[in-house]
C-alpha cells in the first residue's frame, strides 16, 4: 500500500485554560527531510485551516507568530498544541501530513480528534 | 469570489516558447497548492506540475521535466507556466487548478489553449 | 507510479437509470480518491473527495464508495445534465494521477 497512514487521539478534552494537546503521528512510506502539517477543523460539514507548519525534520515546528498552534517533532511524530479554545471552537481536528521533499511526494490525512471545549464557570464574586 | 484566471496561450511552433499565467481572487494564495492540468485533443485529463505554498517545492510530469518551469509570484497572487522547446503533442487546454483543503482539485480555471504546430 | 483505470470507457443509458463507473488504482491509496465532471466545452469540477464525500453543491443522486484499490461513482437517476466526461484521480502521492475517463451519454 502507497499511502501514508496518520494515526491521531479519538478525542482529547481542553484544559480549562482552552488548551489542547495531541499526537499526530505518521507511517512514512519514504526518507523525507522537509514535512508540512496542516491542522483542519471540521464542524458542521465546514472546513477551515486552523494553522499549518513546514519543518525539517529533526527541528522544531515554525507556526506563523499570529498562530494559535505550537508544536514539536520527533521522528515520525509531532506534539501539536492549540491554544486560546473557547466552547465555540468545540470540533473535529484533522491532522494533514505532506512530505514536501525529497521526492516522491506524499499525502496523508488522519481520522481527526474531536476536541471538547468547556468555558470556564466565572469565579463567583467573593466579601472577603 | 474564489477563483482562477488563465491566460497566456496561442499558436506557436515546435521547439518554442509559451509562458501561461494563472491570476488566483478571492483566496490567500501562499496557503495552496496550485497544479497545472491539460486536456488534449480526443485525450482525457493529465496531470502537468504543481507548485506548493510558499513555492520551494515543485513537481512536474516526465513528459514535461526538463522543458517547462512551474512559478509563481505570491505578491501578485498569479502562477506561471513557462512552456520551453514546445512540442505537437503539448498541444491542449491548460487548466490551473487549486489543491484544496482535502487536496483535491477543488477550484478550477477556464482554460487556455495552447496549438503547436508548423 | 500508480495507475488508474476506470470502467467502463463509455457507457449510454436512459434517463432515471442508475449508472456505476468503476475505478482501480494498482497500488492502495486508502480514500485519497476524487471524481471530477467534464461536461463537453466545460472546465472540470469535482465531484467526490476522500472517495465518498459529495462536495459543497453537488447534487446527492451521486455518490462515491470504495477504499484501497477498488472505488466506484454512482449516479443513482441518470439526468440529462449528467451527459459528461467523468475521470477518477487519485491524490496520496506525486504525480497526481487521472483515469482515463468514462464517457456518460443519454440513450
Known amino acids: 500500500c502507497k499511502a501514508m497512514h496518520v494515526a491521531q487521539p479519538a478525542v482529547v478534552l481542553a484544559s480549562s485554560r482552552g488548551i489542547a494537546s495531541f499526537v499526530c503521528e505518521y507511517a512514512s512510506p519514504g526518507k523525507a527531510t522537509e514535512v508540512r502539517v496542516t491542522v483542519l477543523r471540521q464542524a458542521d460539514s465546514q472546513v477551515t485551516e486552523v494553522c499549518a507548519a513546514t519543518y525539517m525534520m529533526g527541528n522544531e515546528l515554525t507556526f506563523l507568530d499570529d498562530s494559535i498552534c505550537t508544536g514539536t517533532s520527533s521522528g515520525n511524530q509531532v506534539n501539536l498544541t492549540i491554544q486560546g479554545l473557547r466552547a465555540m471552537d468545540t470540533g473535529l481536528y484533522i491532522c494533514k501530513v505532506e512530505l514536501m521533499y525529497p521526492p516522491p511526494y506524499y499525502l496523508g490525512i488522519g481520522n481527526g480528534t474531536q476536541i471538547y471545549v468547556i468555558d470556564p464557570e466565572p469565579c463567583p464574586d467573593s466579601d472577603f | 469570489q474564489v477563483q482562477l484566471v488563465e491566460s497566456g496561450g496561442g499558436v506557436v511552433q515546435p521547439g518554442r516558447s509559451l509562458r501561461l499565467s494563472c491570476a488566483a481572487t478571492g483566496f490567500n494564495f501562499s496557503s495552496y497548492g496550485i497544479h497545472w492540468v491539460r486536456l488534449a485533443p480526443g485525450k482525457g485529463l493529465e496531470w502537468v506540475a504543481v507548485?506548493?505554498?510558499?513555492?520551494?517545492?515543485?513537481y512536474y510530469a516526465d513528459s514535461v521535466k526538463g522543458r517547462f518551469t512551474i512559478s509563481r509570484d505570491t505578491s501578485k497572487n498569479t502562477l506561471y507556466l513557462q512552456m520551453n522547446s514546445l512540442r505537437a503533442e503539448d498541444t491542449a487546454v491548460y487548466y490551473c487548478a487549486r489543491a484544496g483543503l482535502w487536496s483535491a482539485f477543488d477550484i478550477w480555471g477556464r482554460g487556455t489553449m495552447v496549438s503547436v504546430s508548423s | 507510479d500508480i495507475q488508474m483505470t476506470q470502467s467502463p470507457s463509455s457507457l449510454s443509458a436512459s434517463v432515471g437509470d442508475r449508472v456505476t463507473i468503476t475505478c482501480r488504482a494498482s497500488?492502495?491509496?486508502?480514500?485519497?480518491l476524487a471524481w471530477y465532471q467534464q461536461k463537453p466545452g466545460k472546465v472540470p469540477k469535482l465531484l467526490i473527495y476522500?472517495?465518498?464525500t459529495l462536495q459543497s453543491g453537488v447534487p446527492s443522486r451521486f455518490s462515491g464508495s470504495g477504499s484501497g484499490t477498488d472505488f466506484t461513482l454512482t449516479i443513482s437517476s441518470l439526468q440529462p445534465e449528467d451527459v459528461a466526461t467523468y475521470y477518477c484521480q487519485e491524490y496520496s502521492s506525486a504525480p497526481w494521477t487521472f483515469g482515463q475517463g468514462t464517457k456518460v451519454e443519454i440513450k
Open positions: 497500488q492502495g491509496i486508502s480514500n485519497y
Open positions: 476522500a472517495a465518498s
Open positions: 507548485i506548493w505554498y510558499d513555492g520551494s517545492n515543485r
